[in-house]
């Protein structure tokens, strides 16, 4: 593929001397894979990110790139290495014909190759500005700590760094990696080029309309004057941040990614690496009124993904589209008619809408939390953001029906005090992807590396499922749900908690022979029950109900259907205490709930009995929800009786530790 500008100096033909024979053969049984954006108009064929295996050194990356050039030259193709990645992901960016992909996939060290694709600013209308003065009294909002210990990196358009709102707060780095603007008649007008980034910088740290008024920012230009960038440019930007962090370690870092493109394995992988290096990444869920899991970086589990709500806490509609939703969204934040710095003049303000603005709010809140508690890990920060959010205020009817249960009903809020939440036992609910409908399909939900999986449940809209179980995978417990024959698929639901110094294990009882049902308890000294799961091989458990739900005096026990194996999650942690709370309804009902009291945190949520008319159980904040089939299809037999079982825990150790600090 010829480059129109003929920019091929150190290209390729000189590399013919490098012999194919020098290549180490790829390991047997491992095949590199090729990925490309599912949204055709966003694809950028001709540019590819070649991702190498994790332990590949820079010298090997360079050698692999040269080998590709030599082999391509031998076939008469020109190629150009645009960038060699190191620091975050090993690999390189190459401009070449798609004809060479088969060749490239066979190179040594290659893990996968991804075709480059576009990413976009997530504000509407980000260049049709409505100049408005700030519409509030500044003294209504004067936070105790403005995030002064934190640096926020903004990957966006260029910005007007001397706007009165942000002057002296934003350091414009020399990083720029943007595609050419579309259209031959495009006129670059500075104020339009700067519009999106200036507004977001103002929302994060603006003097008068900012969330974290003390936060300092650094901007990287990865979006052009039309608000468009590339996955590769964003990757190189993230690598730049990692290298800056290594060269000059500062305090906590927050990276704001107010952009979205189609699902990208490589962009998600880079975000994961940066997050594991201690950086907090916050991103826009996307403005496509769609499942956020179909977009990147929104779909990266390590990133805090933010949807947009309006002043009435309703999901934001943006033209014919609106905020994204689904299990990949962590929480929502204000994203409609947000006042911020306008690049039209140094004192102008403008209102913009979108998930970019929502993400900027959360980046600001994160900066303030980290400034107050600089040692917070990503997991701790995410749990606090969730904990302090306004709960159950979003009208879920706006979301597609199948997404309502998966979408968190949380709107970000500043903690009442930035200190003193340390005593709380924090937990969150993590939904898996849908398993798909095949008979043996399973779905897996995972917690973050420094979270503990305290319980596991499952849910199926058809009710055809074979339960769930906790199992070890790569040294960590995961939650796996099992589909049943004729089922439309299942979800696994993990309850992920912050429990320092915890030692957790799973105790399993196989299906019981007797009619009493299956039971399992935590028999180790000092271990308490945090969750119960049940899994069965039979297609339909029938109507058997254990005569006794839980024998008195044995709170550390899980009980279940005699044909099911029962799994108890048993944990030992300093000062951890748990109790079981049940709410049974004799008549059939579509939903049964039981909540933990103030000061206690829901760690486990399950249903009794495990019969097939129960669709599943899941935790929503501190409430255990058990869903059953539509009452009209069940009839009002005793089969309809369902009990929701909550396990509520608290940590006396954490409470004492926080009292000692105060």
């Amino acid at each position: 593929q010829e480059d129109e500008d003929g920019d091929y100096e150190e290209l390729v033909l000189a590399l013919r001397s490098e012999e194919d024979g020098l290549a180490e053969a790829p390991e047997h049984g491992t095949t590199a894979t090729f990925h490309r954006c599912a949204k055709d108009p966003w694809r950028l064929p001709g540019t590819y990110v070649v991702v190498l295996k994790e332990e590949t050194h820079l010298s090997q990356s360079e050698r692999t790139a040269r080998r590709l050039q030599a082999q391509a030259a031998r076939r008469g193709y020109l190629t150009k290495i645009l960038h060699v990645f190191h620091g975050l992901l090993p690999g390189f960016l190459v401009k070449m014909s798609g004809d060479l992909l088969e060749l490239a996939l066979k190179l040594p060290h290659v893990d996968y190759i991804e075709e480059d694709s576009s990413v976009f600013a997530q504000s509407i209308p980000w260049n049709l500005e409505r100049i408005t003065p700030p519409r509030y009294r500044a003294d209504e909002y004067q936070p105790p700590d403005g995030g002064s210990l934190v640096e926020v990196y903004l990957l966006d358009t260029s910005i007007q760094s001397d706007h009165r709102e942000i002057e002296g707060r934003v350091m414009v780095t020399d990083f720029e990696n943007v595609p050419e603007e579309d259209g031959t008649r495009f006129h670059r007008q500075a104020s339009k080029c700067d519009s999106h980034g200036t507004h977001l910088a103002g929302v994060v740290s603006g003097r008068d309309a900012g969330v974290a008024k003390g936060a300092s920012m650094r901007s990287l230009r990865v979006l052009n004057c039309q608000g468009k960038g590339t996955v590769s440019g964003t990757l190189i930007g993230l690598e730049f941040i990692r290298k800056s962090q290594l060269v000059q370690p500062v305090g906590p870092l927050v990276v704001l990614l107010p952009l979205a493109g189609g699902y990208s394995r490589v962009l998600n992988a880079a975000c994961q690496r940066l997050a594991r290096a201690g950086v907090v990444l916050v991103t826009a869920a996307g403005n496509f009124r769609d499942d956020a899991c179909l977009y990147s970086p929104a779909s990266a589990p390590e990133v805090i993904t933010v949807g947009a709500t309006n002043a009435q806490d309703q999901p934001v509609t943006l033209g014919t589209l609106g905020t994204n939703f689904g299990r990949c969204v962590d929480l929502f934040a204000p994203g409609e008619d947000i006042i911020g710095a306008s690049s039209d003049c140094s004192t102008c303000f403008v209102s913009q809408s979108g998930t970019s603005q929502a993400a900027a709010h959360v980046a600001g809140i994160a900066a303030m939390m980290l400034s107050a508690e600089p040692e917070l890990t990503l997991a701790e920060l995410r749990q606090r953001l969730i904990h302090f959010s306004a709960k159950d205020v979003i009208n879920e009817a706006w979301f597609p029906e199948d997404q309502r249960v998966l979408t968190p009903n949380l709107v970000a809020a500043l903690p009442p005090s930035t200190h003193g939440a340390g005593w709380q036992l924090f937990c969150r609910t993590v939904w898996s992807a849908h398993s798909g409908p095949t008979r043996m399909a399973t779905a897996v939900a995972r917690c973050a590396p420094d979270e503990e999986l305290l319980s596991c449940s499952s849910f199926s809209r058809s009710g055809k499922r074979r339960g769930e179980r906790m199992e070890a995978q790569g040294g960590k417990l995961v939650c796996r749900a099992h589909n049943a024959f004729g089922g439309e698929g299942v979800y696994a639901i993990a309850r992920c908690c912050l429990l320092p110094q915890a030692n957790c294990s799973v105790h399993t009882a196989p299906p019981a022979e007797a009619s009493m049902g299956t039971r399992v308890h935590c028999h180790q000294q000092g271990h308490v029950l945090t969750g119960c799961s049940s899994h069965w091989e039979v297609e339909d458990l029938g109507t058997h109900k254990p005569p006794v739900l839980r024998p008195r005096g044995q709170p550390n026990q899980c009980v279940g259907h005699r044909e099911a194996s029962i799994h108890a999650s048993c944990c030992h942690a300093p000062g951890l205490e748990c109790k079981v709370k049940e709410h049974g309804i004799p008549a059939p009902q579509e939903q049964v709930t039981v909540a933990c009291e103030e000061g206690w945190t829901l760690t486990g949520c399950s249903a009794l009995p495990g019969t097939s008319h129960v669709l599943g159980a899941y935790a929503v904040d501190n409430t255990c929800v058990v869903r059953s089939r539509d009452v009209s299809t069940t009839g009002s037999t005793s089969e309809g009786a369902v009990t929701a079982v909550a396990i509520c825990c608290r940590s006396r150790h954490l409470a004492q530790a926080s009292q000692e600090l105060q």
């Epitope: 700030p134 002296g168 414009v172 003097r207």
Partner: antibody
């Protein structure tokens, strides 16, 4: 360290123009605008306007609109402020300062308008 | 733009505390967080002592503090010292400009 260095004193006749310069050093020039402030003898400080060192946009005090022009030269990190049609009541010390916050000030340039 | 209102003069003895007020309107001091205080010794360049209502630049003594309530901002100097004698000006953003106070002459007795 961050510094703003202004040009020397000027004596002008009424109706003439004066152009004061302000050379910045010690920071990234386009990251901050430059404010201009004056102080007439026995009077307080008066804000004259601001110029963006990033894109050259200006914001002038209403009172001076039409008589003042602010410019920058990013290649030399220098800001300029010109006042035309000088009157005797324009006699003042003119200061440049960094940004709207005015956290760093030049040493001042005395402009005397006298016939 | 009419100037912010400051007392023409205040005085205090060494070691005492004094407060200088700066009254504006809901369009300037009341609306914006960007109130600054400048110390001006005759013949020298002004020096920022407080910015954004209550922030102190590095190098400025902790004896200087700022606050705001409604449309009035205040500068407090505790443990007054002879070198504090100077003119003090407040400033605030307005919707599209910056406005200064008339200045307060501080005399250390």
């Amino acid at each position: 360290q961050v510094q703003l260095v202004q040009s020397g004193a000027e004596v002008k006749k009424p109706g003439a123009s004066v152009k004061v310069s302000c050379k910045a050093s010690g920071y990234t020039f386009p990251s901050y605008g430059i404010s201009w402030v004056r102080q007439a003898p026995g009077q307080g400080l008066e804000w004259m306007g601001w110029i963006s060192a990033y894109n050259g946009n200006t914001n002038y005090a209403e009172k001076l609109q039409g008589r003042v022009t602010m410019t920058t030269d990013t290649s030399t990190s220098t800001a300029y402020m010109e006042v035309r049609s000088l009157r005797s009541d324009d006699t003042a010390v003119f200061y440049c300062a960094r940004g709207y916050v005015m956290d760093v000030w030049g040493q001042g340039t005395t402009v005397t308008v006298s016939s | 733009q009419s100037a912010l209102t400051q007392p023409a003069s205040v005085s205090g003895s060494p070691g005492q505390s004094i407060t200088i007020s700066c009254t504006g309107t809901s369009s300037d001091v009341g609306r914006y967080n960007s109130v600054s205080w400048y110390q001006h010794h005759p013949g020298k360049a002004p020096k920022v002592m407080i910015y954004e209502v209550s922030n102190r630049p590095s190098g400025v003594s902790t004896r200087f503090s700022g606050s705001k309530s409604g449309n009035t901002a205040s500068l407090t100097i505790s443990g007054l010292q002879a070198e504090d004698e100077a003119d003090y000006y407040c400033s605030s953003y307005t919707s599209s400009s910056v406005v200064f106070g008339g200045g307060t002459k501080l005399t250390v007795l």
